[in-house]
């Protein structure tokens, strides 16, 4: 990996739990300042593999609200606007990091958690299983 | 919002920075134990809106490696395997949380950061722009 010289101004790390436990500033810095939020807002409806977005809320998690996609159809929408079962709508999934309150109900103590979320759907050619 | 009774076993939070700065355990708990990692591994090639995955590495970020999708075509792949410009391949983007080392190069001090990543591509009907 890449070795980075340590900044002498770092907070003290003489903690028996270090490096497992770190300090995190929850004032979120948003790097997405110049992107248009409306740009992809209607893809879920215009896609040939349309999806619905479902709200997943968990107060013990940060962020507490995550939106999950569910494909509307098994097949994909063809040029006539009908479902074509020669193709499949499948969810595109991504592993993301969230913070889980640990111990539970604690406002200032968390553990990193990896969860798999469905972000949207795409239309794929099915894998053909040949019967012997 | 939902009010949660505070756990009396929580770490001490009498810190002038609280609640902005919290303790986070970096021992990641993976909730995806029963998912098949190969399940969506070939969607990028089988999709009608195929994409390539690009490695984005930043040692000042946690996770340091993020994979970003880029659509291969402006149009979508039709039943004959050719690009059809009556449809458009578009990236499905998601805002995710990452940890940014702050101050820089510090191993145990981070700030939450929101970044926009492209997870995959989907095929959509284009918005028709009428020329006067």
């Amino acid at each position: 990996g890449i070795t980075i010289p340590r900044n002498p101004g770092c907070p003290n790390s003489e903690d028996k739990n270090f490096p497992r436990t770190v300090m995190v500033n929850l004032n979120i810095h948003n790097r997405n300042t110049n992107t248009n939020p409306k740009r992809s807002s209607d893809y879920y409806n215009r896609s040939t593999s349309p999806w619905n977005l479902h709200r997943n809320e968990d107060p013990e998690r940060y962020p507490s609200v995550i939106w999950e996609a569910k494909c509307r159809h098994l097949g994909c929408i063809n040029a006539d606007g009908n479902v074509d079962y020669h193709m499949n709508s499948v969810p595109i999934q991504q592993e993301i990091l969230v913070l889980r309150r640990e111990p539970p109900h604690c406002p200032n103590s968390f553990r990193l958690e990896k969860i798999l979320v469905s972000v949207g759907c795409t239309c794929v050619t099915p894998i053909v299983h040949h019967v012997a | 919002g939902i009010t949660i009774p505070r756990n009396p076993g929580c770490p001490n939070s009498e810190d002038k920075n609280f609640p902005r700065t919290v303790m986070v355990n970096l021992n990641i708990h993976n909730r995806n134990t029963n998912t098949n990692p190969k399940r969506s591994s070939d969607y990028y090639n089988r999709s009608t809106s195929p994409w390539n995955l690009h490695r984005n590495e930043d040692p000042e970020r946690y996770p340091s490696v993020i994979w970003e999708a880029k659509c291969r075509h402006l149009g979508c792949i039709n039943a004959d395997g050719n690009v059809d410009y009556h449809m458009n391949s578009v990236p499905i983007q998601q805002e995710i949380l990452v940890l940014r080392r702050e101050p820089p190069h510090c191993p145990n001090s981070f700030r939450l950061e929101k970044i926009l990543v492209s997870v995959g591509c989907t095929c959509v009907t284009p918005i028709v722009h009428h020329v006067a």
Epitope: - | R72, H73, N82, V83, D84
Partner: antibody, heavy 120, light 108 residues
Framework: QVQLVESGGGVVQPGRSLRLSCAAS????????MHWVRQAPGKGLEWVTL????????LYGDSVKGRFTISRDNSKNSLYLQMNSLRAEDTAVYYC?????????????WGQGTLVTVSS | SYELTQPPSVSVSPGQTASITCSGD??????VSWYQQKPGQSPVLVIY???RRPSGIPERFSGSNSGNTATLTISGTQAMDEADYYC???????????FGGGTKLTVL
């Protein structure tokens, strides 16, 4: 020899029409998306239009929509650009270009260009 | 509509490294290609898909794309590299190909 050769340029009055041709040789013309790109004198490149390998789908830049029509004849290895209602701002060198098989954001072969001058 | 912005000119001494930038909103999510055009000649593809070099293009030409900026880098610049350089991508919203305004590279 892999090449593209444009023809059909010339001087034309505003409001009139002109048809450009592009002859391809040395490669499987019918397998490629083809484009027209133009360059006004002393200016930069401007994408004009594209046509899919089979001629079924076409896209046009906003400045030529409704006036220009792209077409192709794969049996003759030829690409065409029918330009109607020409304007002074259409004056440019017109290039035909081949789209890369690896995706549209690359034109891997260009012709030598043909000059179109719209003037009264 | 989507725009790609390039500096009008860049100067470099022979043997030095020239960097030509191309900026656009969230450009890292798109593929960028680069074209070299010498006076009186047709454009030539020098970089495609951000970083790839077509056969026949010297190794001194390289490309990158991150954030809002794609960069064409010419290391060990030679007098023969003096030309106009254009970046290009596509825009889904207008379903069109977009060229940058072009950068004139001068080898001093």
């Amino acid at each position: 020899q892999v090449q593209l050769v444009e023809s059909g340029g010339g001087v034309v009055q505003p409001g009139r029409s002109l048809r450009l041709s592009c002859a391809a040789s040395g490669f499987a013309f019918g397998s490629y998306t083809m484009h027209w790109v133009r360059q006004a004198p002393g200016k930069g490149l401007e994408w004009v239009t594209l046509i899919s390998f089979d001629g079924r789908s076409k896209l046009y830049g906003d400045s030529v929509k409704g006036r220009f029509t792209i077409s192709r004849d794969n049996s003759k290895n030829s690409l065409y650009l029918q330009m109607n209602s020409l304007r002074a701002e259409d004056t440019a060198v017109y290039y035909c270009a081949r789209g890369s098989v690896r995706g549209e954001a690359a034109f891997d072969l260009w012709g030598q260009g043909t000059l179109v001058t719209v003037s009264s | 509509s989507y725009e790609l912005t390039q500096p009008p000119s860049v100067s470099v001494s022979p043997g030095q490294t020239a960097s030509i930038t191309c900026s656009g909103d969230n450009l890292r999510t798109k593929y960028v290609s680069w074209y070299q055009q010498k006076p009186g000649q047709s454009p030539v593809l020098v970089i495609y898909q951000d970083t790839r070099r077509p056969s026949g293009i010297p190794e001194r030409f390289s490309g990158s794309n991150s954030g809002n900026t794609a960069t064409l880098t010419i290391s060990g610049t030679q007098a023969m590299d003096e030309a106009d350089y254009y970046c290009m991508t596509w825009d889904v919203d207008t379903t069109s190909m977009i060229f940058g305004g072009g950068t004139k590279l001068t080898v001093l």
